[in-house]
């Protein structure tokens, strides 16, 4: 089945679908592109605003950090909080506000685009939605805490980053999260622009690798604001 | 060459269900996704919701959730959409296409192949 | 649940025209986009996947651009085949949307 060979490190480089190419003919991508898949809920809109359930920061805005909104609170329980300002006690890089990070549990200035840190774990995952059903299968990506003592290899059902080797992310895949590539040099990303302005993908893409920031791919900048293509691009 | 053949066309009334096929062939059926996708006589297309050929994993259109059931049936690579409590307005042509590499972790580019569609008529 | 905007719905042109249709999404969808040709009677076909790859076997008149929210199709020298109804579909989260649709026909 599927998941067991999720579970396994056999399959890598796919070649590309019916007819298509594996980058994509006139974009500076690599020959892995890192375009994923779709996904997600009913979401608040920004006019009706209420509080942004959420399974990550990668899921929030860029003003925001995922956790409970109660100190101590259910770990399950997890919605997108307003990021922290500088001098902010903090606990890892995405709480704190775009141009800072977390540095000895404080939000401190960074250069421009600092590396943002892992997709962050958290306890739990939420993997149904308001259009989803199992119909009568179970859950098949609840796992047991054994498969935790080694780190997940590529295309390993995981619940968090921390689960994975490095140089990789817990992200989404259709129904389950498995372990992804961090994003290279020249990649395609993705650039959660303002509050609410995003679904949940159920493809989705990790961040762009250490040193490196989502930037509007150079040759993008002629094109209207919301045209641009990002790309993990060196600091 | 990768293809999808519909059952034929059907006639029902208004409280019935229709259940329609479509039979993969030239691809491993298992290693993709199928789409739902309907249009009703001059309309544009509606997405009606996916099944994962590997283990049955939905997502419904919130519209038609609690009428509608994707299923497959790996040994005959066929996946099934059927529709229940029929009215008027479900008159269409439902079209099933080919729909995500679900061992494919770097890159998603949605429906590629369809099927000839299955024109259905609710009529009292 | 993500809106695609298309315009315009309906578009008359001649052989030789260079012909531009747009779909706008209510959200930011990265380029999960692709753009549909249908003609009456038969199944979408796929001109165009990840916004701006040409399937295979379509000939190199059509192309796509944009991503994030604002994507366009375009066809350089509109040939007799050509005239059709064109879709977009988004399907970066569920569920997936279709535009409305452009139908193009003779001038």
């Known amino acids: 089945t599927l998941n067991s060979v999720l579970n396994s490190n056999a399959i890598k480089n796919l070649p590309p679908p019916l007819g298509g190419a594996a980058g994509h003919p006139g974009s500076a991508v690599s020959a892995a592109p890192g375009i994923l898949y779709p996904g997600g809920n009913k979401y608040q809109t920004i006019d009706n605003y209420q509080p942004y359930p959420c399974a990550e920061d990668e899921e929030c805005g860029t003003d925001e950090y995922c956790a409970s909104p109660t100190r101590g609170g259910d770990a399950g329980v997890q919605i997108c909080l307003a990021c922290r300002k500088r001098r902010k006690r903090c606990m890892r890089h995405a709480m704190c506000c775009p141009g800072n990070y977390c540095k000895n549990g404080i939000c401190v200035s960074s250069d421009q685009n600092h590396f943002r840190g892992e997709i962050e774990e958290t306890i739990t995952e939420s993997f149904g939605n308001d259009h989803s059903t199992l119909d009568g299968y179970s859950r098949r990506t609840t796992l047991s805490s054994k498969m935790y003592h080694t780190k997940g290899q590529e295309g390993s059902v995981c619940l968090r980053s921390s689960d994975c080797a490095s140089g990789l992310c817990c992200a989404r895949h259709f129904w389950s999260k498995i372990c992804k590539p961090v994003l290279k040099e020249g990649q395609v990303c993705t650039k959660h622009r303002r509050k609410g302005s995003h679904g949940l993908e159920i493809f989705q893409r990790c961040y762009c690798g250490e040193g490196l920031s989502c930037r509007i791919q150079k040759d993008h900048h002629q094109a209207s604001n919301s045209s641009r293509l990002h790309t993990c691009q060196r600091h | 060459q990768v293809q999808l053949m519909q059952s034929g066309a059907e006639v029902k009334k208004p409280g019935a269900s229709v259940k329609v096929s479509c039979k993969a062939s030239?691809?491993?059926?298992?290693?993709?996704?199928i789409s739902w996708v309907r249009q009703a006589p001059g309309q544009g297309l509606e997405w009606m919701g996916w099944?994962?050929?590997?283990?049955?994993?939905?997502n419904y259109a919130q519209k038609l959730q609690g009428r509608v059931t994707m299923t497959t049936d790996t040994s005959t690579s066929t996946a099934y959409m059927e529709l229940r409590s029929l009215r008027s307005d479900d008159t269409a042509v439902y079209y099933c296409?080919?729909?995500?590499?679900?061992?494919?972790?770097?890159?998603?580019?949605?429906?590629?192949?369809w099927g000839q569609g299955t024109t259905v008529t609710v009529s009292s | 649940d993500i809106q695609m905007t298309q315009s315009p719905s309906s578009l008359s042109a001649s052989v030789g025209d260079r012909v531009t249709i747009t779909c706008r999404a209510s959200?930011?969808?990265?380029?999960?986009l692709g753009w549909f040709q249908q003609k009456p009677g038969k199944a979408p076909k796929r001109l165009i996947y990840?916004?701006?790859s040409l399937q295979s076997g379509v000939p190199s008149r059509f192309s796509g651009s944009g991503s994030g929210t604002e994507f366009t199709l375009t066809i350089s020298s509109l040939q007799p085949e050509d005239f059709a109804t064109y879709y977009c579909?988004?399907?970066?989260?569920?569920?997936?949307?279709f535009g409305q649709g452009t139908k193009l026909e003779f001038k």
């Open positions: 030239g691809y491993t059926f298992t290693s993709y996704g």
């Open positions: 990840a916004a701006s």
């Open positions: 959200q930011g969808i990265r380029d999960d």
């Open positions: 296409a080919r729909d995500g590499e679900l061992l494919n972790y770097y890159y998603y580019y949605g429906m590629d192949v």
């Open positions: 579909l988004q399907h970066n989260s569920y569920p997936c949307s």
């Open positions: 099944i994962s050929a590997d283990n049955g994993h939905t």
